[in-house]
Interface confidence: low
């Protein structure tokens, strides 16, 4: 028998500093977890405990901190490779600042294979991306070889932007050919690492033959056995078996994700590449483990560009932006009205000639606006203006509802109005109109959306049986603020990009900007 | 090794603008700050800004944010710094250098440039 | 921004003896451990070379009579048993915040 150690991450997101226990910003460093440099401390830990070692990454390191927004993915190359991983797969996010933010910062600077057998390039962009990432790697480890196949979301054109020259195809498909070239290889040990979340991770157990292990991304999935040892609750044991349409015990695995956790795995294989066993459990990184004094001394340097990016001027507002709760808890705001304007704006994407947009709406919980920004500061913006505003470190994602869903959240949204609670709703593509009057739960009297499939876009009545697409904040996709309808109901989460950054893309985009109050949301007494 | 090669001297009138090239080699460009610093004769050293040129980030200092412009080439490793409205003040030795890396100098400048003898004069 | 001071401006000194250069921040430049001042050594018409990083850390290639001590606002430059191609000028260099920014020089003469 032959044992492999896997260790694993993804969805770190641009955690490169240690985090608080909920993944946002560090504030008592004796409580803080998660960071390269105690991961460094672990896997160096591991690396000279055991003999077969891989650190693998199953994606989306990019996206999600001030870090990201400032090195575009440098960072990410610069801390992998002092990391010395071994292998990554391609998740959606890497896409996001188009395909040559990802050649130039990460795939020309990686010193581990990215992999992705389900991207395929075509046109002008085949030669220059050609073997800047591969569909498989065969990786020598001790004595034996191990091929890493590698898959991404196949949502990708509709999470992120890479652009009209990347196919991407039905994993299943493109990953079964590779796994056979594998095989006739005589590579008999072969792990699928990806991105495209726990269901086709459990997919590719279940239908791709050959492979032995799955390492997984993009669901943030939590896995364990016993007790778990911080908040996040177990989907189901660690690791957890599917058993493939060909009699094999198949273990799939993922690591939740912003770095908190590394996945550590244990696989026995026979001398004809079978998994004999698998056992192991998620590190949780806290400060028990301590940080690596070198990386922590890299770090600290690359942050000092930070604090002096925060306080750039990024544009310019000619009105005041109004984000008190005493405006955004009770009425239509136009800070609230800029941010989800800003969340459609970074979900553009062409893909259909029938559609002028996959998704056109937005909601946005009041109580998450936390701070106005006054224009009578030569109107400047800077980062740290809207990390007033946006202090929370969330993400605004995109998920799929029925019309009765969204009807069920608006009436949550006004149900105990007048209370200066956070739950009232800021929107974009949406006019609602609310009658007061009427008891709580009935108070919705007008819901129009805009079109998305349509070449002039205009606002139709909400139809309570069709699936509609919306961008919010990961907060409300997990039902905060009360809003439990939506995690009950969603019918589709995919996580999107930091908050900050969204509409500091958007401010920067326009340079002057000067949101108005234009009748989105409206309340009418008696009949409509 | 690692070198930092820099272009020659300069002679500006008042008003004009200078650009300073700096081509580095001996090791990766774009995992590295490149910095510029000036030297006014008997005056101490002067930090202007730096650029990162991985990411084209860049950094200036107030006291020249208005005039000057860094930028970098990846394909040929070189970084620029561009002062314009150049006046008698200006008149220095400009250097680049590169900063520290891994686990070493946290943003000391290890290695430097011959540096370039910048003259605004009518 | 923070302004580093040197002194003494100048000094004299024969081969052999033992040098002391001080250099004051208006701030404190160190945390998690870590000092983020640096020396460095320049001779007429060159470019400046690095000596000490982080306060206390020998540059390699650097011989080892250089040292440095500190932390917070207060740093030394030492240099034991001095030797006639020492005679330069030496400076330090925070890298704290942005700006970074340099002490204004001590010329040391053998």
């Known amino acids: 028998a032959w044992e492999l150690t896997i260790l694993h991450t993804n969805d770190v997101h641009s955690r490169l500093e240690q985090t608080s226990e909920d993944s946002s910003k560090c504030v008592n460093a004796s409580r803080c977890m998660g960071g390269v440099a105690r991961l460094f401390t672990k896997v160096q830990q591991i690396r000279r405990a055991e003999p077969n070692v891989l650190l693998l990454d199953a994606g989306d390191q990019y996206q999600g901190t001030i870090w990201f927004t400032v090195y575009k993915g440098a960072e990410v190359a610069h801390f992998m490779n002092a990391l010395r991983y071994d292998a990554m797969a391609l998740g959606n996010h890497e896409f996001d600042n188009g395909v040559e933010g990802l050649i130039e910062p990460l795939l020309k600077e990686a010193k581990f294979p990215i992999l992705s057998a389900n991207i395929k390039a075509k046109g002008p962009l085949a030669s220059q991306i050609s073997g800047l990432y591969l569909p498989y790697k065969v990786l020598p480890v001790g004595d034996e070889v191990v091929g890493i196949v590698g898959y991404t979301s196949k949502e990708t054109p509709f999470l992120s932007n890479p652009g009209t020259n990347l196919v991407f195809e039905d994993e299943i498909t493109a990953l079964q050919p590779e796994v056979d070239k594998l095989k006739t290889l005589n590579v008999n040990k072969i792990i699928a690492l990806g991105h495209s979340g726990f269901e086709m991770d459990k997919l590719i157990a279940q239908k791709v033959r050959g492979v032995d292990v799955v390492v997984g991304g993009h669901s943030n999935t939590f896995l364990y056995t016993g007790n778990p040892p911080s908040k996040e609750v177990p989907a189901g044991k660690y690791p957890f078996i599917v058993t493939s349409d060909d009699g094999r015990k198949v273990p799939v695995v993922q690591a939740y994700a912003f770095g908190k956790y590394l996945g550590y795995l244990k696989i026995e294989f026979d001398e004809r590449g079978n998994v004999i066993s698998s056992h192991g459990n998620p590190i949780l990184l806290n400060s028990s483990i301590p940080e690596d004094p070198s990386i922590k001394a890299d770090i600290n340097k690359w942050r000092i560009k930070l604090d002096n990016y925060s306080t750039q001027e990024l544009g310019k507002t000619i009105v005041y932006l109004d984000g008190s709760s005493q405006s955004c808890r009770f009425r239509e705001c136009n800070m609230g009205n800029l941010i989800c304007d800003a969340m459609i704006n970074n979900n553009l994407r062409h893909t259909d000639e029938m559609f002028w947009n996959h998704v056109s709406m937005c909601i946005l919980n009041g109580g998450g606006i936390r701070s106005p920004i006054d224009e009578r500061n030569n109107g400047t913006i800077t980062w740290e203006n809207l990390a007033a505003v946006l202090p929370f470190g969330g993400t605004f994602d995109l998920v799929q509802l029925k019309g009765s869903t969204l009807k069920k959240a608006f009436e949550h949204s006004v149900h105990r109005y007048g209370q200066s609670t956070g739950e009232f709703l800021q929107v974009g593509g949406i006019h609602v109109v609310y009658d007061l009057s009427r008891k709580p739960g009935d108070r919705v009297v007008k819901l129009d959306v805009l079109c998305t499939k349509c070449r002039v876009p205009s606002y139709d009545p909400l139809k309570m049986d069709e699936v509609y697409k919306v961008i919010l904040p990961n907060f409300l996709a997990n039902g905060g603020d009360g809003f439990q309808m939506i995690k009950d109901e969603l019918l589709r989460h995919d996580s999107g990009d930091q908050d900050i950054n969204v509409v500091s893309t958007y401010i920067s985009k326009m340079k002057v900007i000067y949101p108005a109050v234009e009748g989105r949301i409206k309340f009418s007494t008696g009949s409509h | 090794q690692v070198q930092l090669v820099q272009s020659g001297a300069e002679v500006k009138k008042p008003g004009a603008s200078v650009k300073v090239s700096c081509k580095a080699s001996g090791y990766t460009f774009t995992s590295y700050w490149i910095t510029w610093v000036r030297q006014a004769r008997g005056q101490r050293l002067e930090w202007i800004g730096d650029?990162?040129?991985?990411?084209?980030?860049?950094n200036y200092n107030e006291k020249f944010k208005t005039r000057v412009t860094i930028t970098a080439d990846k394909s040929t490793s070189t970084a620029y710094m561009e002062l314009s409205s150049l006046r008698s003040e200006d008149t220095a030795v400009y250097y680049c250098?590169?900063?520290?890396?891994?686990?070493?100098?946290?943003?000391?400048?290890?290695?430097w440039g011959q540096g370039t003898l910048v003259t605004v004069s009518s | 921004e923070i302004v580093l001071t040197q002194s003494p401006d100048f000094q004299s000194v024969t081969p052999k003896e033992k040098v002391t250069i001080t250099c004051r921040a208006s701030?404190?430049?160190?945390?998690?451990?870590?000092?983020?001042m640096h020396w460095y050594q320049q001779k007429p018409g060159k470019a400046p070379k690095l000596l000490i990083y982080l306060a206390s850390n020998l540059e390699s290639g650097i011989p080892p009579r250089f040292s440095g001590s500190g932390y917070g606002t207060d740093f030394t430059l030492t240099i034991n048993n001095i030797e006639s191609e020492d005679a330069a000028y030496y400076f330090c260099q925070h890298s704290r915040e942005l700006p970074f920014t340099f002490g204004q020089g001590t010329k040391v003469e053998i």
């Open positions: 650029i990162y040129p991985g990411s084209g980030n860049t």
């Open positions: 250098a590169k900063e520290g890396g891994l686990t070493t100098e946290d943003y000391a400048l290890d290695y």
């Open positions: 701030k404190n430049v160190s945390t998690s451990g870590y000092s983020y």
